[in-house]
Interface confidence: medium
């Protein structure tokens, strides 16, 4: 294997998985173990990410791509490329500085991550509460109180078009 010399940067011939080795008159050397180069023409290889502790390996490092991590059970990823692992809580809880705490009355969290959010205020939409909220579930809004008055049709008529030319949803 003889690398052809050209007027362009000789390192541009080095493919992903190699680096342009200054110690060897700029021939393309393979990346050392536990390192990678994802693009051609690199003068160094990059150190593979190591998924340690609360991180676990989702994808092994190869000579051309970095390792990818996710989180061990009981934790979830945060940040670009799973840069952090955050403790899971139960549904109906949120993570605080003091650990997992139950959602306050009037709030809920239906996931193992994130914060408790206020129940929907049905009355703002002119609706009534059909099913009460819990720490784990939002309220379910039903028809407005007027719709449920005696003699009112149980079939909800179509809502008017909000703009001309738009058919009802």
């Amino acid at each position: 294997f003889e690398r052809t010399r050209s007027l362009q940067d000789p390192c541009s011939n080095c493919p992903a998985g190699t680096f342009c080795d200054n110690n060897r008159n700029q021939i393309c050397s393979p990346c050392p173990p536990n390192s990678f180069s994802s693009a051609g023409g690199q003068r160094t290889c990059d150190i593979c990410r190591q998924c340690k502790g609360v991180f676990r390996t989702r994808k092994e490092c190869s000579s051309t791509s970095n390792a990818e991590c996710d989180c061990t059970p009981g934790f979830h990823c945060l940040g670009a490329g799973c840069s952090m692992c955050e403790q899971d809580c139960k549904q109906g809880q949120e993570l605080t500085k003091k650990g997992c705490k139950d959602c306050c009355f009037g709030t809920f969290n239906d996931q193992k991550r994130g914060i408790c959010r206020p129940w929907t205020n049905c009355s703002l939409d002119g609706k009534s509460v059909l099913v009460n909220g819990t720490k784990e579930r939002d309220v379910v809004c039903g028809p407005s109180p007027a719709d449920l008055s005696p003699g009112a049709s149980s079939v909800t008529p179509p809502a008017p078009a909000r703009e001309p030319g738009h058919s009802p949803q």
Epitope: F1, F19, C28, S29, P30, C31, N34, I47
Partner: antibody, heavy 127, light 113 residues
């Protein structure tokens, strides 16, 4: 544990071709440079050349015209051929592995200190 | 080629005393990109292949006793055996791996006085 085992003819006549082979047992064959180094009796060490799994080679300019180093990845072997030998080529020939790269500051560089050596083969050239 | 010159050629030291071997390269082997000196030290006993002691000028290979230490930068390097033991009798070589062809010093023979 990585071990290097080498073999080849030990007695040659002038103008013949020296031929040695080194087999790598254990560890990774790719990702390293594999070298041949020689040592004339009572003298110092001289690097002959190196090869990687892809077949890329580097040779010592002082020997380049007579040397061929090749690789057989299916057998984890690399070989040395030295043409037109003379008495000056009488030496113990060693195969050796280049140490792993050094990673610092987010980047990696090769470092070819030789961390693993074969047992050596004494090659005598005599008419 | 980078020429490696060792001094002295031979050295006789009493057991338990310090042995110091010098190595000088004809050009710097310090690589500015990673601030590493591309220099190694080897020990060779009769009938055996060389054994790597030190790489990156000062990093001890695993399993090497801590009485062996390497120092220096650029063109001037030193291998020190802080307290010579009987089993340290050998020839010691320095080697540069900064640029091909990789080259070795001529060797320093260490004996017991």
């Amino acid at each position: 544990q990585v071990q290097l085992q080498q073999w080849g003819a030990g007695l040659l006549k002038p103008s013949e071709t020296l031929s040695l082979t080194c087999t790598v047992y254990g560890g990774s064959f790719s990702g390293h440079y594999w070298s041949w180094i020689r040592q004339p009796p009572g003298k110092g060490l001289e690097w002959i050349g190196e090869v990687i799994h892809s077949g890329t080679t580097n040779y010592n300019p002082s020997l380049k015209s007579r040397v061929t180093i090749s690789v057989d990845t299916s057998k984890n072997q690399f070989s040395l051929k030295l043409n037109s030998v003379t008495a000056a080529d009488t030496a113990v020939y060693y195969c050796a592995r280049g140490l792993l790269g050094e990673c610092s500051g987010g980047s990696c560089y090769y470092g070819d200190a030789f961390d693993i050596w074969g047992q050596g083969t004494m090659v005598t050239v005599s008419s | 080629d980078i020429r490696m010159t060792q001094s002295p050629d031979s050295l006789a030291v009493s057991l338990g005393e310090r042995a110091t071997i010098n190595c000088k390269s004809s050009q710097s082997v310090l690589y500015s990109s990673n601030n590493k000196n591309y220099l190694a030290w080897y020990q060779q006993k009769p009938g055996q292949p060389p054994k790597l002691l030190i790489y990156w000028a000062s990093t001890r290979e695993s399993g090497v006793p801590d009485r062996f230490s390497g120092s220096g930068s650029g063109t001037d390097f030193t291998l020190t055996i802080s307290s010579l033991q009987a089993e340290d009798v050998a020839v010691y070589y320095c080697q540069q791996y900064y640029s091909t062809p990789w080259t070795f010093g001529q060797g320093t023979k260490v004996e017991i006085k």
